[in-house]
């Protein structure tokens, strides 16, 4: 399977909420011995590979923001910790996977990565990720609402296998 990022750039005003989205593409095995671990983190555009480094989002690590579920299930974070930081990650039946960030500040600007790990038989892992940029703006040049910019077809499928 692959991960697509429908939007490569989100430009938002301070104080707004935003939902960053990734989507699983291709065949997703829904067998009883297959589960999915999904999470989000901040990163930098590395020289070798984007999304290599895992930095916290609002002081929460990728471990704090994870979802873990079977191939046919939906899930969302009910962690008080995440919600106290204005964050919630969610996953639906259709392969959509998102993180919502509330009350954006300039400090939220940066590169965000979604990570999906398909786990088979509890030990075999296939890892994919997607990347997108969030720009939070203030002042007269800031948009009144979030503006999203679609990924080019080439950019929208970031594939990294483990």
């Amino acid at each position: 399977f692959k991960v697509a990022t429908p939007y490569s750039l989100y430009v938002c005003p301070e104080g707004q909420n935003v939902t960053l989205t990734c989507r699983l593409l291709g065949p997703v095995d829904k067998g009883h011995d297959v589960t999915f671990y999904k999470t989000w983190y901040r990163s930098s555009r590395g020289e070798v590979q984007t999304c290599s480094e895992r930095r916290p989002i609002r002081n929460l690590t990728f471990q704090d923001l994870h979802l873990h579920h079977g191939g046919h299930q939906a899930a969302n974070t009910s962690h008080d910790l995440a919600q106290r930081h204005g964050l919630e990650s969610a996953s639906d039946h259709h392969g959509n996977f998102s993180i919502t960030m509330r009350n954006l500040t300039l400090l939220d600007s940066g590169l965000y990565c979604c990570l999906v790990v398909e786990i088979r038989h509890h030990h075999s892992e296939h890892r994919v990720h997607g990347a997108m940029e969030l720009q939070v703006q203030t002042g007269k040049d800031a948009p009144s609402n979030c503006v999203v910019y679609p990924s080019s077809s080439q950019d929208s499928e970031n594939i990294t296998a483990a």
């Epitope: 589960t35 671990y37 990728f62 873990h68 509890h122 890892r127 296998a161």
Partner: antibody
Framework: QVQLVQSGAEVKKPGASVKISCKAS????????MNWVRQAPGQGLEWIGL????????SYAQKFQGRATLTVDKSTSTAYMELSSLRSEDTAVYYC???????????WGQGTLVTVSS | EIVLTQSPATMSASPGERVTMSCSAS?????MYWYQQKPGQAPRLLIY???NLASGVPARFSGSGSGTDYTLTISSMEPEDFAVYYC?????????FGQGTKLEIK
């Protein structure tokens, strides 16, 4: 803060079994796999196996298949490793360690020394 | 099973010296992980996904490599860096460690 606290040292006779516990706190127990690694005196690290508290799924290194049994008690966030048919070569420090999927073992227990001697 | 071979098995260095150690895999792996272990202590994660520093690890440590050849470098040795270093792979089951490189004070 994240903690993995293991049970105390054990002395066993050859042929016996030992069961070690690893109590987790400070994190979501079901979001990680619990791995077991051992280290014989003066030797390197050897991976025994893992268990997913999320669904109880296990994987073992071939060497320990059939002799090691990994279990969890989600109600107490505790992982267990039982090793049967002990022999002198099983004398080692046994560690539990948590691992997030697609990551590494970032927190380890303090280790449990198991001595097998007649 | 993927066999990880670390070299050298033992090496000596002085504080302030640059140190490099290697980990060679018997077949290609996607990522390498490095741990540090001091006597009487549990291992500590140093490097994840080949080249990224784990939380709290000083910037003098760095990792690199791909395929079958990986390297851990300490740019300027500090007294607390004398320890045993292990590489490990999660790419293929069963998950294996190298035999370790012992870093001693010269």
């Amino acid at each position: 803060q994240v903690q993995l606290v293991q049970s105390g040292a054990e002395v066993k006779k050859p042929g016996a079994s030992v069961k070690i516990s690893c109590k987790a706190s400070g994190f979501s127990f079901t979001g990680y796999t619990m791995n077991w690694v051992r280290q014989a005196p003066g030797q390197g690290l050897e991976w025994i196996g893992l268990i997913s508290p999320y669904n109880g799924g296990t994987s073992y290194a071939q060497k320990f298949q059939g002799r090691a049994t990994l279990t969890v008690d989600k109600s107490t966030s505790t992982a267990y490793m039982e090793l049967s048919s002990l022999r002198s070569e099983d004398t080692a420090v046994y560690y539990c360690a948590r691992r997030a999927y697609g990551y590494a073992m970032d927190y380890w227990g303090q280790g449990t020394l198991v001595t097998v001697s007649s | 099973e993927i066999v990880l071979t670390q070299s050298p098995a033992t090496m000596s260095a002085s504080p302030g010296e640059r140190v490099t150690m290697s980990c060679s895999a018997s077949s290609s792996v996607s990522y390498m992980y490095w741990y540090q272990q001091k006597p009487g202590q549990a291992p500590r994660l140093l490097i994840y996904d080949t080249s990224n520093l784990a939380s709290g690890v000083p910037a003098r440590f760095s990792g690199s490599g791909s395929g079958t050849d990986y390297t851990l470098t300490i740019s300027s040795m500090e007294p607390e860096d004398f320890a045993v270093y292990y590489c490990q792979q999660w790419s293929s089951y069963p998950f294996t460690f190298g035999q370790g490189t012992k870093l001693e004070i010269k």
